[in-house]
C-alpha cells in the first residue's frame, strides 16, 4: 500500500524538514530559513514562531519543529503553548483587570501568579488555628480544642527551619 501511495503521490516521500516543491517537479526541497515542517509529505513549510517583546525563546526553531516561547522575568505564561504572557504580582496579591491588588482579609496567595484563595477553615476538620493566616500564607491548623484540654499532651511546635549548611548554634 505504501508503495502504491508513493507511486500515486511523490510528495509522500518528502520527510519532515522538507516540502514537496511543485515549482521543481515535486522534488523534496529543504525548508527555507525560519520555517519548518514537522511531518512528512507537506507541500509547504510553516513559518517559525517568533518570540518577541515579553515573549522569549525557550526552544529555537529547527527545520522539523517550531520555536517555543516562554515569558521574560516579571511575566508568566498563560494559554496553550504560551499564547499569552501575564504580569506577575507579589505574593499576597492577585492580578485583576485593574492590575495587582492585595488579597482581601481571609484569603491568601503564596505565589506570584494565580488568585487569592480562602484560608483553610480548621474547624471543618475539628481542628483549631495554630498559626494565623496572612495575605501570603494559609493558616496552620493544629489539634482540635478537645486535644488541648488539661491533661492532654501538649503539641510540640515544629523546629524552625535552618539554612542548609548551617549547624545549630
Amino acid at each position: 500500500f505504501e508503495r502504491t501511495r508513493s507511486l500515486q503521490d511523490p510528495c509522500s516521500n518528502c520527510p519532515a524538514g522538507t516540502f514537496c516543491d511543485n515549482n521543481r517537479n515535486q522534488i523534496c526541497s529543504p525548508c527555507p530559513p525560519n520555517s519548518f515542517s514537522s511531518a512528512g509529505g507537506q507541500r509547504t513549510c510553516d513559518i517559525c514562531r517568533q518570540c518577541k517583546g515579553v515573549f522569549r525563546t525557550r526552544k529555537e526553531c529547527s527545520s522539523t519543529s517550531n520555536a517555543e516561547c516562554d515569558c521574560t522575568p516579571g511575566f508568566h505564561c498563560l494559554g496553550a503553548g504560551c499564547s499569552m504572557c501575564e504580569q506577575d504580582c507579589k505574593q499576597g496579591q492577585e492580578l485583576t483587570k485593574k492590575g495587582c491588588k492585595d488579597c482581601c482579609f481571609g484569603t491568601f496567595n503564596d505565589q506570584k501568579r494565580g488568585i487569592c484563595r480562602p484560608w483553610t477553615n480548621c474547624s471543618l476538620d475539628g481542628k483549631s488555628v495554630l498559626v494565623n493566616g496572612t495575605k501570603e500564607r494559609d493558616v496552620v491548623c493544629g489539634p482540635s480544642p478537645a486535644d488541648l484540654s488539661p491533661g492532654a499532651s501538649s503539641v510540640t511546635p515544629p523546629a524552625p527551619a535552618r539554612e542548609p549548611g548551617h549547624s545549630p548554634q
Epitope: R49, G53, V54, F55, C69, F75, L78, C82, S83, M84, C85, E86, Q87, L95, K97, G99, C100
Partner: antibody
C-alpha cells in the same frame, strides 16, 4: 484562533440610535476589558471607553459620555456599543479591541470595524 | 486628558531609508506600578489598526526588527531603520496609563 467579528455597516437617520456588536471567538471577553475606538473618515483614532464584561463596569472618555453606551453579554461572548441621537459627527468606523495593560497576547487583536453612516 | 502630540504629520521616505516619528505626552506616562503604557499602532490603508510596539519598546510578534521604540516619561520615538513598501500607512501612539486613554493624531508614512 482569536478573532473579533463586528456587525455590518449601518446607514441611519439623524436623531436615531444604533447598536453595534463585537463577537469574540477564541477567548472569553469576561477576562478582559473591551475597548471601543472611533475613526471618522480621513481622521485619527479616538478612544470611546472600555467595559469590564464580567460586572458591566464602564469608563468613558468625557467626550462620549451621554453619546455612547457600552454593554456586554458574556453568554454570547459579545460586547455592544449603542450610539444615541446620531448626527453627521457620528459618521465613522467603530472598532473593538480587548486591550490590557497586564496580559499580552502573542498576537494583538482588533475587530474588523463597523461603518456607521448618518444621513437623511 | 493627556494630549499626545505626534510629529511629523506626514513623512515621505524612499525605500531603504530610515524614518523616525516622535510622540510627546502632556504628562508623564510612567505608571505607579513602574511601567510605561505607551503603544505604537500601524493602520494600513483600508485595514484595522494593528499594534506594533507596547510598553514603549516591546515588539509584537511578526513585527520586523527594523522597528524600534524608545523613550520615557513624556518623550517617545518610533524608528524604522530601513523602510519597506509594506510599512506605508498611518502610525499612532496610544497611551494606556491615564484615563481617558488617548491617541496621537497620527503620522502618515508615504513612499517617495
Amino acid at each position: 484562533e482569536v478573532q473579533l467579528q463586528q456587525s455590518g455597516a449601518e446607514l441611519v437617520r439623524p436623531g436615531a440610535s444604533v447598536k453595534l456588536s463585537c463577537t469574540a471567538s477564541g477567548f472569553n471577553i469576561k477576562d478582559y476589558y473591551m475597548h471601543w475606538v472611533k475613526q471618522r473618515p480621513e481622521q485619527g483614532l479616538e478612544w470611546i471607553g472600555r467595559i469590564d464584561p464580567e460586572d458591566g463596569d464602564t469608563e468613558y472618555a468625557p467626550k462620549f459620555q451621554g453619546k455612547a453606551t457600552m454593554t456586554a453579554d458574556t453568554s454570547s461572548n459579545t460586547a455592544y456599543l449603542q450610539l444615541s441621537t446620531l448626527t453627521s459627527e457620528d459618521t465613522a468606523v467603530y472598532y473593538c479591541t480587548p486591550y490590557s495593560n497586564y496580559v499580552y497576547w502573542y498576537f494583538d487583536v482588533w475587530g474588523t470595524g463597523t461603518t456607521v453612516t448618518v444621513s437623511s | 486628558d493627556v494630549v499626545m502630540t505626534q510629529t511629523p504629520l506626514t513623512l515621505s521616505v524612499t525605500i531603504g531609508q530610515a524614518a523616525s516619528i516622535s510622540c510627546k505626552s502632556s504628562q508623564s506616562l510612567l505608571d505607579s506600578d513602574g511601567k510605561t503604557y505607551l503603544n505604537w499602532l500601524l493602520q494600513r490603508p483600508g485595514q484595522s489598526p494593528k499594534r506594533l510596539i507596547y510598553l514603549v519598546s516591546k515588539l509584537d510578534s511578526g513585527v520586523p526588527d527594523r522597528f524600534t521604540g524608545s523613550g520615557s516619561g513624556t518623550d517617545f520615538t518610533l524608528k524604522i531603520s530601513r523602510v519597506e513598501a509594506e510599512d506605508l500607512g498611518v502610525y499612532y501612539c496610544w497611551q494606556g496609563t491615564h484615563f481617558p486613554h488617548t491617541f496621537g493624531g497620527g503620522t502618515k508614512l508615504e513612499i517617495k
